[in-house]
Interface confidence: medium
């Protein structure tokens, strides 16, 4: 019979014959012959292959480096790569999430408009009149000044964008 010029799905052409590809999670040890099947071996620990293949080497699982702010989100298997994500307080620097950076903190006088996510940084906004923030934080919004009136007190010291108002007792009229 004529040697094949194309092979079925999950096969590959070598030496004018069709051999079975190795299944995901296995690598090629030796091609098939007239008399023998393709020989495959499972990937070792911390290795994977995610497709039907004829690779002689498995790929190393991705390494989630804590010094780059990364941690394992999903442990790799012989058929899947490890998925890394950013640690609490960090976000990815790229779509591939190969490294992370610390979330920005909003300085005193600024509050958090939008809390950072794993992929986006903190968005800060200046505290408007009547609001303040006295901390550097990646979570705290601007807080409203204390209302002295509702406590039957008077303002002794005006508030700023970084400090709350200071309330004090009302001066009693002397008899």
């Amino acid at each position: 019979p004529e040697p094949p010029t194309a092979c079925r799905e999950k096969q590959y052409l070598i030496n004018s014959q069709c051999c079975s590809l190795c299944q995901p999670g296995q690598k090629l040890v030796s091609d098939c012959t007239e008399f023998t099947e393709t020989e495959c071996l499972p990937c070792g620990e911390s290795e994977f292959l995610d497709t039907w293949n004829r690779e002689t080497h498995c790929h190393q699982h991705k390494y989630c480096d804590p010094n780059l702010g990364l941690r394992v989100q999903q442990k790799g298997t012989s058929e899947t790569d490890t998925i890394c994500t950013c640690e609490e307080g960090w976000h990815c620097t790229s779509e591939a999430c190969e490294s992370c950076v610390l979330h920005r903190s909003c300085s005193p006088g600024f509050g958090v408009k939008q809390i950072a996510t794993g992929v986006s940084d903190t968005i800060c906004e200046p505290c408007p009149v009547g609001f303040f923030s006295n901390v550097s934080s990646a979570f705290e919004k601007c807080h409203p000044w204390t209302s002295c009136e509702t406590k039957d007190l008077v303002v002794q010291q005006a508030g700023t964008n970084k400090t709350d108002v200071v309330c004090g007792p009302q001066d009693r009229l002397r008899a």
């Epitope: 480096d65 804590p66 010094n67 780059l68 702010g69 941690r71 394992v72 640690e87 609490e88 307080g89 960090w90 950076v101 610390l102 979330h103 903190s105 934080s137 990646a138 979570f139 705290e140």
Partner: antibody, heavy 122, light 110 residues
């Protein structure tokens, strides 16, 4: 943080040291082991992070094992095939990774245990 | 391999004076700021002074100041006091993760 007693060991012996922590949780902080040879600099041995994942200095990888017991708040360093070059004061320290709430800091060790002297001699 | 090179020992300063110790890394530290400074006195464990290259650790006097990024870092002590006589170490964190300590710089007060 406080290390267990060191002592005198013979070459080829296995060293086991325990670090007991209090006042904070091993589920938030990493713990590192660092050593200092007499009159010498400091050398990072390795760390165990809040997930229980271990990391080692290249030189220590083949003969060091760090484990933890979160119920007992202890972290253990086991080092095999001791030689005279392993004579040092061994410290455990909190760090280098901490993540939690509004704080995330990395790359530093604080506080440190008082250290324990390990002497390897025949 | 990563190497941290510190100012050669000893460095001396008068009481009230200023000392600057440098720490040079053979390659950039992680995040450009995984660099911390420690003070160590004989018979004691190291004490953290500065982390993140420039952030003062809790309870450390403001006369200690850290600076730098990437591969070049400095620790400056202004208004030297007798109690500041000690050996100072820098530590770098690198992808890997790897942590390397500098050789230490002894500071003596005249």
């Amino acid at each position: 943080v406080k290390e267990s007693e060191g002592g005198l060991f013979k070459p080829t012996d296995t060293l086991t040291l325990t670090c007991t922590v209090s006042g904070f949780s091993l589920s938030s902080y990493a713990i590192s082991w660092v050593r200092q040879a007499p009159g010498n600099g400091l050398e990072w041995i390795g760390a165990i992070d809040r997930y229980g994942t271990t990391y080692y200095a290249t030189w220590a990888k083949s003969r060091s094992t760090i484990t933890r017991n979160t119920n007992e708040n202890t972290v253990t360093l086991k080092m095999t095939s001791l030689t005279a070059a392993d004579t040092a004061t061994y410290f455990c320290a909190r760090g280098p990774w901490y993540y939690g709430g509004d704080v995330a800091w990395t790359g530093s060790f604080d506080p440190w245990g008082p250290g324990t002297l390990v002497t390897v001699s025949s | 391999a990563q190497v941290l090179t510190q100012t050669a020992s000893p460095v001396s300063a008068a009481v009230g004076g200023t000392v600057t110790i440098s720490c040079q890394s053979s390659q950039s530290v992680a995040n450009n700021d995984f660099l911390s400074w420690y003070q160590q006195k004989p018979g004691q464990p190291p004490k953290l002074l500065i982390y993140g290259a420039s952030t003062l650790a809790s309870g450390v006097p403001s006369r200690f100041r850290g600076n730098g990024s990437g591969t070049q870092f400095t620790l400056t002590i202004t208004g030297m006091q007798c109690d500041d006589a000690a050996t100072y170490f820098c530590t770098g964190g690198y992808a890997g993760p790897i942590y390397i300590f500098g050789g230490g710089t002894e500071v003596v007060v005249k």
